[in-house]
């Protein structure tokens, strides 16, 4: 069964900077990745980025840069320009659309006791939805 993993880390140098890493574990080719925050895509979350292997990428503030790390994983850099860090308690969700499997989505957040630069290991988290 395909799985999606989500990893959120705080940057050691910039406490207001975060990076979300997401990956798809399974066969098939990725046709689209959607990253959202505050909840799943289409279920109360706010779209942060979309990445397409041919059409390119788009991101929306506070996302700064979305990029492919491998053919089945992506990273998204975020910058919290506010005085506080709402990202610390925010859920980030990644949805991978693949052929022929369909769509798979999982969510993750910054571990509660994260030291800057540290993060939870990139283990698969429960799949919230498979379309």
């Amino acid at each position: 069964t395909p799985e999606v993993w989500v990893q959120v880390q705080m940057e050691a140098t910039e406490l207001s900077s975060f990076t979300v890493h997401c990956g798809f574990l399974g066969p098939g080719s990725i046709s689209l990745v959607t990253v959202s925050w505050g909840g799943p895509d289409g279920a109360g979350g706010t779209k942060l980025a979309v990445l397409h292997p041919e059409l390119g990428t788009r991101q929306w503030a506070p996302a700064r840069q979305a990029r492919w790390e491998t053919q089945s994983s992506i990273s998204l850099a975020l910058e919290d320009s506010g005085a506080s860090s709402p990202f610390a308690n925010t859920t980030f969700c990644c949805k991978f659309a693949s052929f022929p499997e369909g769509s798979w989505e999982s969510c993750g957040s910054l571990p509660p006791s994260s030291d800057p630069g540290l993060s939870a290991p990139p283990t698969p988290v429960p799949i919230l939805r498979a379309d």
Epitope: G38, G39, G42, G44, G45, T46, K47, V50, H52, L55, G56, T57, R58, W60, A61, R64
Partner: antibody, heavy 119, light 106 residues
Framework: QVQLQQSGPELVKPGTSVKISCKAS????????INWVKQRPGQGLEWIGW????????YYNEKFKGRATLTVDKSSSTAYMLLSSLTSEDSAVYFC????????????WGQGTTLTVSS | DIQMTQSPSSLSASLGGKVTITCKAS??????IAWFQHKPGKGPRLLIH???TLQSGIPSRFSGSGSGGDYSFSISNLEPEDIATYYC????????FGGGTTLEIK
């Protein structure tokens, strides 16, 4: 087909507020950001802010923070912009525009709403 | 904030001719630039996004190029309906429009 239909022209007094609407049709309203853009007479375009209808999350140009409030009504696929404490500087044409994501920013626009602030 | 400096602010050209408009960003915008055509009484029309990608239905007379902080937009074989004001827009982070270029036909 995608359409953004804006409310009609407004003539209001200084110090009051006005709420402009933008009704979307032809696509899934909750999937795309709605932006608001200002154009003063004889001047260029200025981005006010965006709202993501799926969550109601907003982001504002610093210049308009506290003056503009963006909201949506998902049931009617309508976006709203409330402008408060109006002055003559707010007299302008206001546009709503959809951000098409990978299809490009501001790929569909409303026809514009003319706001005149005068005593 | 990212600033966009668009030039010229106005230009005049002959039918069948070619015009070029430039936009300079205050920092690298990673090719996230779009170009719009705006006619009085209407909403602007997206012509090009991601520097050079033509929107569906836009004739190939319109083109865009550039990288880093320097971008250009051209219209060749000018037609009467090209009379309009043209704007660039950076969308690398938030959105900033250029000041606009008013095109008139000689």
């Amino acid at each position: 087909q995608v359409q953004l239909q804006q409310s009609g022209p407004e003539l209001v007094k200084p110090g009051t507020s006005v709420k402009i609407s933008c009704k979307a049709s032809g696509y899934t309203f909750t999937d795309y950001y709605i932006n608001w853009v200002k154009q003063r007479p004889g001047q260029g375009l200025e981005w006010i802010g965006w709202i993501f209808p799926g969550s109601g999350n907003t982001y504002y140009n610093e210049k308009f923070k506290g003056r503009a409030t963006l909201t949506v009504d998902k049931s009617s696929s309508t976006a709203y912009m409330l402008l408060s404490s109006l002055t003559s500087e707010d007299s302008a044409v206001y546009f709503c525009a959809r951000d098409g994501g990978l299809r490009g920013p501001f790929d569909y626009w409303g026809q514009g709403t003319t706001l005149t602030v005068s005593s | 904030d990212i600033q966009m400096t668009q030039s010229p602010s106005s230009l005049s050209a002959s039918l069948g001719g070619k015009v070029t408009i430039t936009c300079k960003a205050s920092q690298d915008i990673n090719k996230y630039i779009a170009w719009f055509q705006h006619k009085p009484g209407k909403g602007p029309r997206l012509l090009i996004h991601f520097t050079s990608t033509l929107q569906s239905g836009i004739p190939s007379r319109f083109s865009g190029s550039g990288s880093g902080g320097d971008y250009s937009f051209s219209i060749s074989n000018l037609e009467p309906e090209d009379i309009a004001t043209y704007y660039c827009l950076q969308y690398d982070y938030l959105y900033t429009f250029g000041g606009g270029t008013t095109l008139e036909i000689k």
